[in-house]
Interface confidence: medium
């Protein structure tokens, strides 16, 4: 891996990749794009899934945080032989199934989808793709689209969350490498630190949550700070302010010394959460402190 910027966010990342006949001579470029991007998401809490679509959608690698499984998944991805039609909706279906199932199991982890296609979607196929992307959104996902070569940017803006969630690659497949940094910057939602990280037991505090990507939410009014206290009860708080690199949140009053609150952020009013390893602890503060 080549160092450089990385993402420390804990969420579920789905790659939905076009393997239709039109990418036959460009699969290597798609593979290397995914491989380099995948290595930049380095949180141990980040899970990844590889989905490919042509005339049907196939989950090549189910959601996993296991780095060895991801390595094997990338090997499988490299072996893919493209062919068939561009049934992008089938790819979104495979993602939604996993999001739906994970939510059902009680894992309300935030989902980010990066969908890549190289062609215009005709009539029904566009309608189905938009519909399936909407279903993924309804399940809490943030959807980004990468369009290469003969894509229709208006279509992709409707499949993705917005025009700002579309990455156009107009110079052909070899130019995919050039958007890795911007995709990483836009798709990464991460919690890096909390200030203060130690608070006084029984007192009210405001916490500054440092990170990135907090304004990537479709609606910033739906951003929440979430505190999971002693691995049991979760309290959600509405931030006083939401900026891209920090949130200002009221902290819950933790009555006892030694209590721990793990910090999470929801971008969708508590439907799903970005996890982190950031912990706020309580300490005893004397009257003078």
């Amino acid at each position: 891996e080549d160092g450089g910027p990385a993402c420390y966010g804990g969420f579920d990342l789905y790659f939905i990749l076009d393997k239709s006949g039109s990418v036959l001579h460009h699969w290597n470029e798609i593979y290397y794009f995914v491989e380099q991007l995948a290595h930049k998401f380095i949180s141990p809490q980040l899970r990844m899934s590889f989905i490919v679509f042509s005339t049907r959608g196939t989950t090549l690698m189910k959601l996993t945080e296991d780095r060895e499984q991801i390595r094997q998944g990338l090997e499988e991805l490299q072996k893919v032989l493209p062919g068939g039609d561009t049934y992008m909706h089938e790819g979104f279906e495979r993602a939604s199934e996993q999001i739906y199932y994970e939510n059902r199991q009680g894992y309300r982890t935030a989902s980010v989808i990066i969908a890549l296609t190289d062609g215009e979607l005709h009539e029904d196929l566009f309608f189905y793709s938009e519909r399936e992307a909407n279903r993924s959104r309804d399940l809490g996902a943030i959807v980004y689209c990468v369009g290469v070569k003969d894509f229709n940017e208006t279509q992709l803006a409707r499949i993705a969350d917005s025009k700002d969630h579309v990455f156009p690659v107009n110079d052909g497949f070899q130019a995919l490498q050039g958007i890795i940094h911007s995709i990483l910057k836009k798709s990464c939602i991460e919690i890096l630190a909390a200030e203060p990280s130690t608070i006084c037991a029984g007192e009210s505090f405001q916490v500054v949550v440092r990170g990135n990507g907090f304004r990537h939410a479709r609606n910033v009014d739906r951003v929440l700070c979430s505190f999971k206290i002693n691995d049991s009860v979760t309290l959600n708080e509405k931030p006083f302010s939401v900026e891209d690199t920090y949130l200002l949140c009221p902290a819950p009053i933790l009555k006892e010394v030694g209590m721990k609150a793990a910090l999470q952020v929801s971008m969708n009013d508590g439907l799903s959460f970005i996890s982190s390893s950031v912990i706020i602890t309580t300490t005893h503060c004397s009257d003078g402190s």
């Epitope: 279906e93 199934e97 739906y100 199932y101 939510n103 059902r104 519909r131 909407n134 279903r135 959104r137 309804d138 399940l139 439907l271």
Partner: antibody, heavy 118, light 107 residues
Framework: EVQLQESGPGLVKPSETLSLTCTVT????????WNWVRQAPGQRLEWMGY???????YTNPSLKSRITINRDTSKNQFSLQLNSVTPEDTAVYYC????????????WGQGTTVTVSS | EIVMTQSPATLSVSPGERATLSCRAS??????LHWYQQKPGQAPRLLIY???QSISGIPARFSGSGSGTDFTLTISSLEPEDFAVYYC?????????FGGGTKVEIK
Amino acid sequence: EVQLQESGPGLVKPSETLSLTCTVTGDSISSDYWNWVRQAPGQRLEWMGYISYSGNTYTNPSLKSRITINRDTSKNQFSLQLNSVTPEDTAVYYCARYKTIDSSFDVWGQGTTVTVSS
Amino acid sequence: EIVMTQSPATLSVSPGERATLSCRASQNIRDFLHWYQQKPGQAPRLLIYYASQSISGIPARFSGSGSGTDFTLTISSLEPEDFAVYYCQNGHSFPYTFGGGTKVEIK
């Protein structure tokens, strides 16, 4: 208690548009998923589609582009439009709710019978 | 789409007896299977969700089991009000589909 009530004409002519409204009380249509399900005489139940809490719609591909589901959050109502009806669309039409991250229809309207005939 | 097949189409049982209804999915739907009861002139009523999860207000004599493609609804001891049509529903994949129903009638 959540209640759903379907309303609309009981008779529609072939090739015309069937329009039904479901009024929801006891819950907000800005949460959960709001569905239309129908049952033709002697047939199994057929899920037609939903409108979600966010306003996204998802419909049964068998109905192709004939179906439209809309909502009016100010009245807490959602509606069904089915274009180019034929006698095969004669059925009891139900509106039903399912909860977010669920897929079982836990609350139903009592149903309204629609006959397609000239 | 996933095809749901119920058997038998009609089940004749005496009150107090046990009734076992089957539902088969054309592909693996894990436990995303729901059961409904429908009486003449009424809307369906949810009995069991996610194959075996009970609903508050539904009598304990109704129970569900199964996973994957084969599912069973059991009514341990039939009461007079249980004679109705029972439907299973695929909740795994769109479009959601229902079985053809099993009519439980008095023997």
